[in-house]
């Protein structure tokens, strides 16, 4: 598709001076041509052209040799040959002035007085000043009209029939139009049938209302069909509202309302003039009482890593509206003290969506969360636990000895969630500890070797490695991991012979 | 993207009415003129209708002139078809379309079945 | 009412064809005329707009020719997913007419 073409001067509205020369380029990827404000036999002091220059691009311009009054109006560059008539001139505008002391309006054809509204529809009284600065009233038989003014358009409101007058002051000289005619076309073959239901889910004992409003015609025949029509449940009502237009308002009222009154809410109008039929429909659900259903779009056991931003989503129903609160570890949270926020929000009619959101998340956000829901006739509750996933790392790695027996104990203790496995190396030739190779697992079955793992708390873990008798100095590595990370800590145990060269990696 | 749903078919006696309706949306439906094709079964397009982009001018194809009438609401960006007195030959799916194109119509709704049948 | 008259009403033609569809107006209707490809259950899509201008999107083996009464569409190498009914149209003033339709089948 072509770019719209660009025009020179590049403004929306210019000011030409009475009687000066002005020209308009327009450049354009094909042929483009120009539309202005006067007919064919009125343009002879306007000239079209189109110049040759270097961009690739087509140029024509528009000049006026000698601008006046009847130059005032909407210039568009388009392209020619993408125009249709049913659709609106798609191209490039900008809107001329021509200020004439003498002629306060831009001169008009004779059919441009008579003013044509369809439907009390709102209407342009084409009365346009040469000078943007000009004041304007309206006028009809009554006094001044209030409507709202452009002056590149005119007037525009809603009109009843009758003769109007534009009236303009140009230093000091007033000016009126001749008399714009506003002619009525009324009655459309289409109905214009709105409905409109503020609540479509209720309880039991409250009263269902449906509205149906017919716009813009007196003659129409209105039938209602809903649940308790047969037993005459509903109180059928109609206002008629004829400002600013014809409105037939048609209320349906079905007080004490019963789960029985659950079904569709039909309207049907019928011009009476015609065979037109027009019908609107509504579903209303009425519960025996009050009701919650929680939806969680999560499980209710939720890991969370250390640092990480997470959401937690909470589809709730309910009917009447509920009040949502959120509690951690059955005590309401207290978001300004936490990097935790909720927020609850209306979706539909009846649905709404509660978030949990954790900023930046802590070990001590690990807790039980529960969202609990709320109304005057149903409470219900959601509870999941969070864990913050922290990576394993060891807190401490000492020995202990058995005094003269020659047995030793390494404790390694070591935290994280999940809590981490601890896993024991032995490396037995000192001085090769430092090639991979050298280091072997300790399995649980080694005879003279005793692995336990003691759980100090929910994050806290304790692993011993007891070796009967250390006749040599050998290297021990504690090992802790879990999902998130590992770290490893050596230490050498030296025989009791050689205690003195006791160190800790 | 531009699209176009027709809606309001359906199954009507003879002499009855029927009023189609074609939601717009993707782009300025208040700049263009808007069309309803038709297509009986088995058979080719028939133009049906024109409405301009403001309202201010309506055609329509020679079949149908009296009894159908093309309507818009431009805030709503919706165009309608009313069809008042519908005979069996008036059968067919019937599209909106609409166009920039120097007069052919580069969108087009998936269409809505009206059958009229006794 | 213009009248716009297309032939054939029908080909057959196997892939990789060329296949030539022609279409007359009743009267002089300079460049305004489109192109449409329709396939069973589907709404329309243009193809070709002023007599010879290529819709955005559409392959470049479609071209348009013609101006005044007579106008062809051509297809240079038929492809499998071109087989439908081609249909032309006038697209200045109204009413809108189209052609009867050519429906291009496999051989």
């Known amino acids: 598709q072509l770019s719209l073409p660009s025009i020179l001067p590049n403004e929306n509205e210019k000011v030409v001076q009475l009687n000066s020369s002005f020209s308009l380029r327009c450049f354009g990827e094909s042929e483009v041509s120009w539309q202005y404000p006067m007919s064919e036999e009125e343009s002879s002091d306007v000239e079209i052209r189109n110049e040759e220059n270097n961009s690739g691009l087509f140029v024509t311009v528009l000049e006026v040799s000698s601008a006046s009054a009847a130059h005032t109006g909407l210039y568009t560059c388009y392209y020619n040959h993408t125009q249709t008539e049913e659709n609106e001139l798609e191209g490039r505008h900008i809107y001329i002035y021509v200020p004439d002391p003498d002629v306060a309006f831009v001169p008009l054809g004779m059919t441009d007085y008579l003013v044509i509204v369809e439907d009390d529809d709102s209407a342009i009284i084409p009365c346009r000043t040469t000078d943007p600065e000009t004041p304007v009233t309206l006028h009809n038989s009554e006094g001044v009209v209030p409507a709202s003014y452009d002056s590149r358009q005119g007037f525009n409101g809603t009109f009843t029939v009758g003769p109007y007058i534009c009236e303009a002051t140009v230093k000091g000289k007033k000016f009126q139009t001749i008399p714009f005619n506003v002619y009525a076309l009324k009655a459309t073959s289409e109905l214009d049938l709105e409905m409109e239901a503020l609540k479509t889910v209720y309880k039991s004992g409250e009263t269902i209302v449906v509205t149906c409003a017919v716009f813009n015609n007196e003659v129409v025949d209105l039938q209602w069909t809903y649940p308790g029509e047969v037993k005459g449940k509903g109180i059928t009502m109609l206002e008629e509202i004829k400002v600013p237009s014809i409105k037939l308002v048609y209320t349906l009222t079905v007080p004490e309302a019963t789960v029985k009154d659950s079904g569709d809410y039909e309207c049907a109008a019928r011009q009476a003039t015609r065979e037109v039929k027009e019908m609107k429909k509504v579903t209303i659900s009425v519960h025996e009482k009050g009701f919650i259903e929680i939806k969680p779009t999560f499980s209710q056991l939720e890991a969370v890593n250390l640092h990480e931003v997470k959401h937690f989503v909470v589809e709730v129903r309910a009917y009447p509206p509920p009040r949502i609160s959120w509690l951690k570890n059955n005590l309401t949270l207290i978001e300004n003290l936490t990097e935790i926020t909720t927020d609850v929000e209306k979706i539909q009619e009846i649905r709404y969506r509660s978030k949990l959101k954790l900023i930046r998340a802590k070990e001590e956000d690990s807790g039980h969360y529960t969202i609990v829901a709320q109304n005057e006739d149903a409470v219900k509750s959601y509870t999941f636990e969070l864990l913050t996933q922290v990576p394993s790392s060891i807190l401490d790695l000492v020995d202990d000895h058995h005094g003269s027996t020659g047995g030793q104990t390494v404790r390694c203790t070591a935290e994280g969630t999940p809590l981490p496995d601890i896993e024991w190396m032995i490396c037995k030739d000192i001085k090769k500890c430092n090639n991979e190779t050298s280091w072997t697992i300790l399995a649980n079955n080694v005879s003279n070797i005793i692995t336990e793992i003691h759980s100090r708390d929910r994050s806290t873990v304790e692993g011993r490695v007891t070796f009967a008798k250390v006749e040599e100095t050998i290297a021990v590595r504690c090992l802790a991991k879990n999902l998130l990370g590992a770290e490893n800590r050596e230490l050498k145990l030296v025989a009791p012979t050689l205690r003195s060269e006791l160190t800790v990696a | 993207q531009v699209q176009l749903v027709e809606s309001g078919g359906g199954v009507v006696q003879p002499g009855r009415s029927l009023r189609l309706s074609c939601a717009a949306s993707?782009?300025?439906?208040?700049?263009?003129?808007m069309h309803w094709v038709r297509q009986a079964p088995g058979k080719g397009l028939e133009w049906v209708a024109v409405?301009?982009?403001?309202?201010?001018?309506?055609y329509y194809a020679d079949s149908v002139k009296g009894r159908f009438t093309i309507s818009r609401d431009n805030s709503k960006n919706t165009l309608y078809l009313q069809m008042n007195s519908l005979r069996a030959e008036d059968t067919a799916v019937y599209y909106c379309?609409?166009?920039?194109?120097?007069?052919?119509?580069?969108?087009w709704g998936q269409g809505t079945l009206v059958t009229v049948s006794s | 009412d213009i009248q716009m008259t297309q032939s054939p009403s029908s080909v057959s033609a196997s892939v990789g064809d060329r296949v030539t569809i022609t279409c007359r107006a009743s009267?002089?209707?300079?460049?305004?005329l489109a192109w449409y490809q329709q396939k069973a259950g589907k709404a329309p899509k243009l193809l070709i707009y002023?007599?010879?201008s290529l819709q955005s999107g559409v392959p470049s083996r479609f071209s348009g020719s013609g101006s005044g009464t007579d106008f062809t569409l051509t297809i240079s190498s038929l492809q499998p997913e071109d087989f439908a009914t081609y249909y032309c149209?006038?697209?200045?003033?109204?009413?809108?007419?189209f052609g009867q339709g050519t429906k291009v089948e496999i051989k």
């Open positions: 379309a609409g166009g920039r194109s120097r007069g052919a119509f580069d969108f």
């Open positions: 993707g782009f300025t439906f208040s700049s263009y003129g």
């Open positions: 149209q006038r697209t200045n003033s109204f009413p809108r007419t």
């Open positions: 009267q002089g209707i300079s460049s305004w």
């Open positions: 409405i301009w982009y403001d309202r201010s001018n309506k």
């Open positions: 002023s007599a010879s």
